[in-house]
Interface confidence: medium
């Protein structure tokens, strides 16, 4: 084991936000720490205060500009440091050269809506939020539907291997309440990960007409 094992993980949302989590075993809860971002080819630098999210982990968001502004590119390198106050000085606790487009995690999809619903199927659309125009169509999605009596973890994943901001759910049960979620991931980036799941969209299929099935 390494004394004071720590993790410093950051992701870029592809536009103007770098979110970071810093955890350290045995760290003092009341220690004041911050993340400092220093780009190699930009005139700005940015700092955010790490706030506790659990017993031994802290998080913060580096806000680089307006939400839809393109603040970094594929050639940028941002030196990220964790600085913690020790007495009268700030000590650099962790460091990394952060390549934003190798460490992507987009915002969760938004504006989910039911386009059309029938007894056995439902067409749902959504939008991506604060995603760089650099991706063009190089995005993929995962979706899941919560059925009555099941958990989200049990829901099978539906994969959309292209930039398709809609889905037609089929083989649904008539007159049944469902919930639906979707998440997005760029194809680019060695350490890129899935966005958080969207807020769930609740919908209900139409009842079967008496004497016939539609």
């Amino acid at each position: 084991a390494v004394n004071g094992t720590s993790q410093f993980t950051c992701f870029y949302n592809s536009r103007a936000n770098i979110s970071c989590v810093w955890s350290q075993d045995g760290a003092l809860q009341d220690t004041s720490c911050q993340v400092h971002a220093w780009p190699d080819r930009r005139r700005w630098n940015q700092t955010c205060e790490l706030l506790p999210v659990s017993q031994a982990s802290w998080a913060c968001n580096l806000i680089l500009g307006a939400p839809d502004s393109q603040k970094l590119t594929t050639v940028d390198i941002v030196t990220l440091r964790v600085l913690c106050r020790e007495g009268v000085r700030w000590r650099v606790m962790a460091i990394q050269d952060f390549k934003p487009f190798e460490n992507l995690r987009l915002m969760a999809p938004i504006s989910l809506q039911v386009v059309h619903v029938e007894t056995h199927r439902c067409n749902i659309s959504w939008e991506i939020s604060q995603a760089s125009h650099y991706f063009e169509r190089h995005l993929e999605f995962e979706a899941r539907t919560l059925s009555p009596g099941h958990t989200w973890e049990e829901a099978p994943l539906l994969t959309l291997k292209q930039k398709q901001e809609w889905i037609c759910l089929e083989t649904l049960t008539p007159d049944t309440q469902y919930e639906f979620q979707v998440r997005v991931k760029p194809l680019q980036g060695e350490f890129t990960t899935w966005s958080p799941w969207s807020q769930p969209l609740a919908f209900r299929t139409k009842p079967a007409a008496l004497g016939k099935d539609t």
């Epitope: 993790q7 410093f8 993980t9 030196t79 606790m93 460091i95 350490f191």
Partner: nanobody, 123 residues
Amino acid sequence: EVQLVESGGGSVQAGGSLRLSCAASGRTFSDYTMGWFRQAPGKEREFVVAITGTGHTTDMPDSVEGRFTISRDNAKNTIYLDMKNLKPGDTAVYYCASARGLPVTPLGDIIYWGEGTLVTVSS
């Protein structure tokens, strides 16, 4: 995969100096933050210092501050730890490490370790 090979360890009298080297092969060297850890007999492995590909460094523990210096030569795929005014308390196996960031092991990342080089400081 990254391979790390340390060298430069040995025995030295208190007050003496050593220069440790760590040669890396494999992935693009400048992409990786490199650093040094040490493990004294009977103790846990301890983080000493790290340097990013662009040359930024972490602060060192108070016990070595002002005596140890880290540097890197990206053209030679090598990092160095210059140690002066060595003390018996510096006796340890010194390990080179490489990852996206140090002393961290980010989620989903791999941290690469060398085999270590022994430094013995006698009084």
